[in-house]
Structure formats: C-alpha cells, structure tokens
Amino acid sequence: NKILVKQSPMLVAYDNAVNLSCKYSYNLFSREFRASLHKGLDSAVEVCVVYGNYSQQLQVYSKTGFNCDGKLGNESVTFYLQNLYVNQTDIYFCKIEVMYPPPYLDNEKSNGTIIHVKGKHLCPSPLFPGPSKP
C-alpha cells in the first residue's frame, strides 16, 4: 500500500520565494510522520524536512542550507521556501513516510514540481555559500 502524492506541475518563484503544497491520499491526523522535499531528478538534495508528531509542534529543518518552513493540513504539507537562487530552478519532489502507528507507509514517487526561480539574482554571501550545485 502506497500513499499517492499530488503536486503542482510548475510554480514560479517571483520574489525568490514559493509555497509548494504536497497533497497526500492519506490523513496525517494523529500520525507520526516525516515529510520531505527533494531537489533534482535523482532527488539527491533533501531541501527541507517536516517531522509531525501527535503531541508536539511540527519540527521543520533543512540540513542543506535552504530557508524553509512547513505547514500541516490533514492531508497535506506545504513547504514555504525563501531566498531561492535563480540557479536553484529545478524539479522538486515531495516525499512522505508515515512511521507511527504501524504499519510503515511511504509514497509512490510523484511527478514533481518544476520551480522556476525568476526573482532578483540573489548572490550567496561568502560566509554562506549557495546550498546546492547549479
């Protein structure tokens, strides 16, 4: 049994920011889960992670230097990405793993969302280089 994920085929980030909504064929209420957003055809870069827990606030983080936030709906997680660079235009895939209660469930690979970053050409500062390769 796999969870199905729906994403917009394409989004344009005009001000270096975008909301990407991942809609699941599964109700996340009272579940413990790990939702993540991955960049590239091979999903090589984990852009943002949202840990959902029945009793605690959402934990949202990026280990790859992206500025991200997350918002939870009953059957969706929305990733809010800011300070995107033009060279981060790419395809982005939503992923979900529901861990508790068992059984473990994850998703069929979605079609992804092409995020086209059209914003101002942000230059990475020397102290904080861009988080991913062009």
Partner: antibody, heavy 120, light 111 residues
Framework: EVQLVESGGGLVQPGGSLRLSCAAS??????????VSWIRQAPGKGLEWIGS???????YYNPSLKSRVTISRDNSKNTLYLQLNSLRAEDTAVYYC????????????WGQGTLVTVSS | DIQLTQSPSSLSASVGDRVTITCRAS??????????LHWYQQKPGKAPKLLIY???SLQSGVPSRFSGSGSGTDFTLTISSLQPEDFATYYC?????????FGQGTKVEIK
C-alpha cells in the same frame, strides 16, 4: 538465516563518546519492509529504546537521548552504527541492535549485545 | 510517553503451573482493530526473545503453551503449563507511539 552481531563495547571515560557497530546478515538494511533499532539495558534494569532507522535511512530517536545520539548505516557493509556522545555513568549498559518488520514493529531478531561501561 | 506497568513484578511458581502476567498501558495502544503490544522473554546474560506480537499472535517457533490476549490498555501473557526453561524475566513492549517503551519486567522464579 538472519543474524545481528554488535561490537565496539568496552570501557569509556565519562564525557567521552562511543561508536557501536551492528553487522547484519540474512537481510539487507536497505530493503523495504524491515528496520533496525538500538535498545539498551542497564545492569539489573529494564529495556530502553534508543532509536530506529528505516530502510530509507530515516531515523527516529528517543527524545530523552536525542541530543546525544546518532544512528547511521553503511549499506555496502550492511552495518548499522550507534554514536553516543557526552557519556555518563548512567549510560553503562548492554547495547542491543534488534530488527523489526514494518507490520507491527515487534523486535523479531536481536543481537547478542555489547557491554559499555562508563567509568573513570 | 506511554507507560507500561506489569504485574506482578515477580512471582514464584512450580513446573506445570499456569502463570498469568498482566501489562497495563497508560493509554490505548490499539489502532484500526490492531493492538501494538508485544511480549518478550529474557534469560540472564541473553538477549530478549519475541514470544507474542500484536497482543495475541504467536511468534514462529515459540511453544503453544504461551498465549497472549487483551486490547486497548489491558493485556495478558499466559503460560499454560510452566516448564523448567520458562523461568526467566518477561517484558511487554508497545510500538504504537514513540518513544517505544517496555514494561519494567516480571521475573518468574522457581518455587
């Protein structure tokens, strides 16, 4: 035949770190359907879950240890690792790795355990 | 966290006795009709061994004298006729929520 073999235990100084290994055979750590957890047992005490890793590489930790623990794996060696930092006397325990299936998360196979003693 | 309380903490019994151990959870561990409560046996110096999973399913290779029952918050492990090799400590465990937790154990000793 499924087998789990822990290694790396021994005497560690307070404040130090430990890195334990769990070599798996008879199944692949990266195959969907099974995961592995670390569980410990202080001398004469009960069992305490440390954390789990899934076939995807995703991890879950016991909040009481989360700030000090990392579970990782090397798929090429089919081996699981436990890193525990800032060790204290209360971390003295036998450390077990145990496999679970995704249906119920019951631990169906266990290693023999490795003893870690934290003492100066 | 879900607390699991086993009773009794220890018991003395003779070979052939019927032994019952209970495990009470601080909240329900049921989900869609399944109970995420498991039982293990541990002998001194050895790793625990899975006996019963999902409250009442006998793990492969475990003798049929072991049985489990219960749902929600109250669970029971029964040994219908105690054998010499059954003297050990028994633990319940829940896998409904993180952190996964174990009962404090019940030691079954020879009378």
């Amino acid at each position: 035949e499924v087998q789990l073999v822990e290694s790396g235990g021994g005497l560690v100084q307070p404040g130090g770190s430990l890195r334990l290994s769990c070599a798996a055979s008879g199944f692949s750590l990266s195959t969907s359907g099974v995961g592995v957890s670390w569980i410990r047992q202080a001398p004469g005490k009960g069992l305490e879950w440390i954390g789990s890793i899934y076939h995807s590489g995703s991890t879950y930790y016991n909040p009481s240890l989360k700030s000090r623990v990392t579970i990782s794996r090397d798929n090429s060696k089919n081996t699981l690792y436990l890193q525990l930092n800032s060790l204290r006397a209360e971390d003295t325990a036998v450390y077990y790795c145990a496999r679970y299936e995704y249906g119920y998360y019951a631990f169906d196979y266990w290693g023999q355990g490795t003893l870690v003693t934290v003492s100066s | 966290d879900i607390q699991l309380t086993q009773s009794p903490s220890s018991l003395s019994a003779s070979v052939g006795d019927r032994v019952t151990i209970t495990c009470r959870a601080s909240q329900s561990v049921d989900f869609y009709g399944k109970s995420f409560l498991h039982w293990y046996q541990q002998k001194p110096g050895k790793a625990p061994k899975l006996l019963i999973y999902a409250a009442s399913s006998l793990q492969s290779g475990v003798p049929s004298r072991f049985s489990g029952s219960g749902s929600g918050t109250d669970f029971t492990l029964t040994i219908s006729s105690l054998q010499p090799e059954d003297f050990a400590t028994y633990y319940c465990q829940q896998s409904y929520r993180t952190p996964l937790t174990f009962g404090q154990g019940t030691k079954v000793e020879i009378k």
